[in-house]
């Protein structure tokens, strides 16, 4: 007996769609072998109509597809625009059509229910609004107008022009009679329920001269849209519920095993803690549509999601909804990268951000997730070099190591830097990822002066002490600007007094500016790296003043002043907008930091092709 299983009988009506699921044992051979859907002919042969290798027969072109879900051991055949010619006997199977791994499926497509002549069909999703049009003749204009629902052989009054409203339709139905000259009345039913489904009769007048019109109302529960995303990636649910609910609170919820729907996020400020740091509800457009972005997808995020509108910010029967079935593919194209990066106060972190390697030219961004209200993510830095003002001198986005990964370095860490950050590009939105920065106890590994004042025209020597564990790393000094950090020549000066336990392995790398010019003012970073992977960094600010005393100046950590005060971000941070899905620059109004001079000028600055290290970068 074949191990393939599916529906034995599928019945539908003309114009409809079917979605036929076939199940197979998910062995490695079965998962990767050809899947097919074929029609059995009179000769007994089974002619392929669609297969997992991309084949689609001519009479299925544009209306059918086959999707394999290998980790679940299922494949799905979707067929749209059914006609009665599609009725017949089919097989869904694996491998070759003539071999045994298949299951017989009978498909029957009928004409649909016989409706009285002239019946108007209204097909509407549950929770939405329908307007039933009811024409009448002039002589019935002054007479009673009514709408009945046919239940079996009887007709039940739903509403009439004498102000009667059936209790089942209370507060959600209205009958509109137009001004003179218009020979049509309308009945509007809001917040449709599944129980509203059925045949209705409009009536104007009574006796043999009455006007009648039949209406067939089909109320559909929205079929969930299948959404298939990669583990660690991102999903966007676009929710368009119509203008009728434009001003009503919106929500996204996930259906649980008890069949209720747990709010994931809503516009009233509620958010499920399981999505902390990785969810945003984009403010709605004028038409009431909105979207929800979830990053850092986990296997446990799988399930059925509903978006909807209701004043309580949660699911209520009879209000409009949209549905999705989210699958999270464990065979992900998105590489593993740490979801938590730890740093110490005063230290630094180097965060690796994945992006779609096919989009190496895309703009790269890094933003700070803020949980207030619906969540927002103001941009902090982008690959074109724009940096939020308060991050001046301590944040840089580097294109390295490249080939699907960029690096973000943040130094001078404080406890206020703890939080969730998103890596994103202006390309493939599914590659958005989330990283949490945690500030832990400890001392920075690199030691530099806090603040240095250099004298114009003289020599400045800035030391950077590093411990023995970095002895095999490449050390560098660079001058920070809002477009990156340009490497400068530096020299290794041998043992350092700063780390007494490490003897000759504890070393010092120094930056010498000779002679100091006005252009030298600004932020300098001392750092370590291995190839294109960056490790820790330490920042020092150099101020330049007029000559007061002759002679060169050597700064030791004992003479270092406190770092300059951070500039505070002004208020103009905009919340993420729908457009930001296409253009993440709209996550925030960027504050552009003025470029700080000519990268230390002349022959004294050698430009390295920037570079990156493992996630983290704190004293262990």
């Amino acid at each position: 007996k074949s191990p393939v299983f599916g529906p034995q009988e599928v019945s539908s009506v003309e114009g409809n769609s079917v979605s036929i699921k076939c199940y197979y044992p998910p062995t490695s051979v079965n998962r990767h072998t050809r899947k097919y859907w074929c029609r059995k002919g009179a000769s007994g042969r089974c002619i392929t109509l669609v297969s997992s290798e991309g084949y689609v027969s001519s009479n299925y072109a544009g209306r059918a597809n086959l999707t394999n879900f290998p980790e679940n051991g299922t494949f799905v055949v979707n067929i749209a625009q059914l006609s009665r010619d599609d009725s017949g006997h089919y097989k869904c199977g694996l491998g070759i059509n003539s071999r045994g791994l298949s299951f017989d499926v009978s498909l029957e497509v009928s004409q649909g229910p016989e409706l009285p002549n002239g019946t108007e069909v209204y097909t509407v999703d549950v929770g939405r609004t329908v307007t039933i049009k009811c024409p009448f003749k002039t002589e019935n204009a002054p007479k009673t107008k009514a709408l009945y629902k046919k239940i079996g052989q009887t007709s039940v009054l739903v509403i009439d022009s004498r102000n009667y409203v059936n209790p089942n339709y209370k507060d959600r139905i209205r009958l509109r009679i137009p001004g003179t000259g218009q020979l049509i009345f309308t009945v509007v039913i809001d917040r449709l329920r599944l129980s509203d489904h059925g045949l209705y009769l409009c009536q104007a007048g009574d006796g043999s001269n009455r006007d009648e019109k039949n209406a067939d109302l089909q109320v559909l529960e929205p079929e969930p849209e299948l959404v298939y995303e990669d583990l660690r990636g991102s999903v966007t649910f676009h929710c368009a519920l119509g203008l009728e609910v434009a001003n009503v609170a919106k929500f996204l919820c996930r259906v649980n095993s008890r069949e209720t729907c747990d709010v994931v996020i809503n516009t009233l400020g509620k958010r499920d803690s399981a999505f902390e740091g990785r969810i945003l509800l984009n403010p709605q457009d004028k038409d009431g549509s909105f979207s929800v972005v979830i990053t850092g997808l986990r296997k446990e995020d799988e399930g059925r999601y509903l978006c909807g509108a209701h004043s309580d910010g949660q699911l209520q029967e009879g209000w409009p909804i949209q549905a999705w079935q989210l699958f999270v593919n464990e065979e992900s194209t998105i590489p593993r990268s740490p979801t938590v990066v730890k740093g110490v106060a005063g230290g630094s972190v180097a965060v690796l951000c994945p992006y779609n390697p096919k989009e190496s030219q895309s703009l790269k961004y890094w933003c700070l997730w803020e949980g207030a209200q619906n969540g927002r993510c103001p941009l902090l830095v982008e690959s074109q070099g724009l940096v939020q003002e308060q991050y001046e001198g301590r944040l840089s986005l580097l294109q390295e190591p490249g080939n699907g990964t960029f690096t973000v370095i943040l130094n001078q860490l404080t406890t206020q830097d703890a939080g969730f950050y998103w890596c994103l590009t202006n390309g493939d939105t599914r590659w958005r990822t989330t990283v949490e920065i945690k500030i832990i106890e400890g001392e920075p590994n690199l030691k530099v002066p806090g603040n240095v004042t250099a004298v114009l025209g003289e020599t400045l020597n800035i030391p950077c002490h590093f411990p023995c564990k970095f002895s095999s790393y490449e050390k560098y000094w660079c001058k920070w600007s809002n477009t990156g950090c340009q490497t400068l020549p530096s020299q290794d000066e041998g043992p350092s007094e700063a780390f007494v336990n490490c003897d000759e392995n504890s070393r010092l790398v120094s930056l010498t500016l000779n002679p100091v010019t006005r252009a030298d003012e600004g932020w300098y970073w001392c750092g370590v790296k291995q190839g294109h992977f960056y490790g820790e960094t330490a920042a020092v600010y150099v101020a330049v003043e007029e000559k007061k005393v002759a002679g060169s100046r050597y700064v030791s950590p004992a003479k270092a002043d406190a770092a300059p005060d951070e500039k505070v971000l002004d208020s103009g941070v905009r919340e993420i907008e729908n457009k930001a899905i296409q253009d993440p620059r709209l996550f925030a109004e960027e504050k552009v930091v003025a470029d700080t001079g000519d990268q230390a000028g002349g022959s004294r600055a050698s430009v390295d092709s920037s570079s990156s290290e493992e996630q983290g970068g704190s004293s262990k």
């Epitope: 529906p7 539908s12 409809n16 599944l194 069949e259």
Partner: nanobody, 130 residues
């Protein structure tokens, strides 16, 4: 909460027929799928048949051991499901349980797996005598 109530069980002769019914109540909306499982003494619960619907489209699933003998159907309102049992055999003797599902779940959900059904009836005994 959804309540499922089975009826129609009883004693039937080999080769005879029986029709089981299962009525769902307690919710204002219809279930998405309903099915039948059976359990003979000392054995695991076994899939018999299931019916799933979406608008005017219906999908019927039948377990291998009853194929060609048992059929599943439902009433127009979608709240009652029937199992027509023809050509019954002594090995069909078991407690027959009705199951229902309100939520169209993930693509991996297999109607044959009892764990994937949310609601269950208390069962009705079917005994086939030889």
């Amino acid at each position: 909460e959804v309540q499922l109530v089975e009826s129609g069980g009883g004693l039937v002769q080999t080769g005879g027929s029986l029709r089981l019914s299962c009525a769902a109540s307690g919710r204002t909306f219809s279930p998405y799928a309903m099915g039948w499982f059976r359990q003979a003494p000392g054995k695991e619960r076994e899939f018999v048949a299931a019916i799933r619907w979406s608008g005017a489209t219906t999908y019927k699933y039948v377990g291998g051991s009853v194929q060609g003998r048992f059929t599943i159907s439902r009433d127009a309102a979608g709240n009652t499901v029937y199992l027509q049992m023809n050509s019954v055999k002594p090995e069909d003797t078991a407690v027959y349980y009705c199951a229902a599902d309100r939520v169209p779940k993930d693509i991996s959900i297999d109607p044959r797996n009892p764990k994937d059904w949310d609601y269950w009836g208390k069962g009705t005994q079917v005994t086939v005598s030889s």
